[in-house]
Interface confidence: medium
């Protein structure tokens, strides 16, 4: 069969090969499309409701005034010339619709290096067949699930028109020390070949690099925070500020009910003491400052001590030294 592509809403003429140019003609068209149940036969005589969808022209060609999604399918013509020679024409018709130019909506003006960020959502409306959306960084394709790139896609079909709306949400984790103004764009590639991609206008969010707060340092002994059951861990909070601020201790994001102190001793470590600890310096002049967190974990005899442990319950036998 010969492949024919036709744009939705536009006319289509299919030639019936071997048919006499003028009546009388011995020919018939057979259609198997979304409008038919099995095969529908159309003759030059025509008439009836089918004339508005497809009719046979005086030269034997089949004329569709405005093709729609339901006209996709197989069209066959069988014609006999004046000498009684039979000719068959066979067409596979596929329809398409080019959507409007895709757009990036909900775009971020700023991204944070080192953490996942939503860049934006690419939207394409009114395509058929659905087609695909793809993202580009500085003109190069972005591959989902590689280097901190993830894409969430959604395809919806309009209940009346049958046309597709595509959505693609891009999340990226910008590398530290990378491009401070990356250029992102999105392109729509049609589902049928021979049609060029449509690209959005680019967006250029700023990449912001978080600067770690260096003022409050947390020193842990033993180094790495891994200790055998029954051992002791000493946490020391070092704050260069003068006068010395009050030091509070946090475990798993919850303040420990202890008097303020720059030193925290965890004697006779048990499972309940495992978790993530940090110290908070509260100043009268400005807001609190918190250290980086350290993870305290128990190692069984014979295990290698990890540099970072797991998160656990609330500590019991905890001492804060004034």
């Amino acid at each position: 069969a010969q492949n024919i592509t036709a744009r939705i809403g536009e006319p289509l003429v299919l030639k019936c090969k071997g048919a006499p140019k003028k009546p009388p003609q011995r020919l018939e068209w057979k259609l198997n499309t979304g409008r038919t149940e099995a095969w529908k036969v159309l003759s030059p005589q025509g008439g009836g409701p089918w004339d508005s969808v497809a009719r046979v022209l005086p030269n034997g060609s089949l004329f569709l005034p405005a093709v729609g999604i339901q006209d996709e399918g197989i069209f066959r013509c069988q014609a006999m010339n004046r000498n009684g020679k039979e000719t068959k024409s066979n067409y596979r018709v596929r329809v398409y619709q080019i959507p409007g130019k895709p757009e990036i909506v909900d775009s971020a003006s700023e991204l944070t290096a080192g953490v996942p960020n939503k860049v934006g959502t690419c939207v394409s409306e009114g395509s058929y067949p659905a087609g695909t959306l793809s993202w580009h960084l500085d003109g190069k394709p972005l591959v989902p699930n590689e280097k901190g790139v993830s894409v969430k896609e959604q395809t919806r079909r309009h209940p009346e028109t049958g046309l597709f709306t595509l959505q693609s949400e891009l999340m990226v984790t910008p590398a530290r020390g990378g491009d401070p103004r990356p250029t992102f764009s999105c392109s729509f590639s049609p589902g049928l070949p021979r049609h060029r991609a449509l690209r959005t206008a680019p967006i250029q969010p700023r990449v912001w690099e978080p600067v770690p707060l260096e003022e409050v340092q947390l020193v842990v002994e033993p180094e790495g925070g891994a200790v055998a059951p029954g051992g002791t861990v000493t946490l020391t909070c070092e704050v260069p500020a003068q006068p010395s601020p009050q030091i509070h201790w946090m475990k798993d994001g919850v303040p420990l009910p202890l008097p303020p102190s720059p030193v925290l001793i965890l004697p006779e470590i048990g499972p309940q003491d495992q978790g993530t600890y940090s110290c908070v310096a509260t100043h009268s002049s400005h807001g609190p400052q918190e250290s980086r967190a350290v993870s305290i974990s128990i190692i069984e005899p014979g295990e290698e001590g990890p540099t970072a442990g797991s998160v656990g319950g609330s500590g019991l036998g905890t001492l804060a030294l004034a």
Epitope: A108, E110, V115, W208, L213, E290, A293
Partner: nanobody, 116 residues
Framework: EVQLVESGGGLVQPGGSLRLSCAAS????????MGWYRQAPGKQLELVAL???????NYADFVRGRFTISRDTTKKTLYLQMNSLEPEDTAVYYC??????????WGQGTQVTVSS
């Protein structure tokens, strides 16, 4: 630079209500767990409420049923709706957030005074 700025504190009578806000700048807000903490004069710092990156809220026993934590990711703002306020709720209220690479950031605090 990351900045958390609290507002909405003030003087209120017992039984009254206040809504605290914490506006974040310089970060992607929606992916971070955040919390409200408070410190009364001469008292320890204490956790009031936490909201996870997925929106799950947790409350300290002393505020459960009276306070509600919420966030508006489009406005990059964390809220604490405080109802049925008691004199014991008088404190400086701070918001705290976790950002990249395990850094924690705090606002400068907003004073809440409950008194008749």
């Amino acid at each position: 630079e990351v900045q958390l700025v609290e507002s909405g504190g003030g003087l209120v009578q017992p039984g009254g209500s206040l809504r605290l806000s914490c506006a974040a700048s310089g970060t992607i807000f929606s992916l971070n767990p955040m919390g409200w903490y408070r410190q009364a004069p001469g008292k320890q710092l204490e956790l009031v409420a936490l909201i996870s990156d997925s929106g799950t809220a947790n409350y300290a026993d002393f505020v459960r049923g009276r306070f509600t934590i919420s966030r508006d990711t489009t406005k990059k703002t964390l809220y604490l709706q405080m109802n049925s306020l008691e004199p014991e709720d008088t404190a400086v209220y701070y918001c705290r957030s976790t950002f990249a690479a395990g850094n924690f950031y705090w606002g400068q605090g907003t004073q809440v005074t409950v008194s008749s």
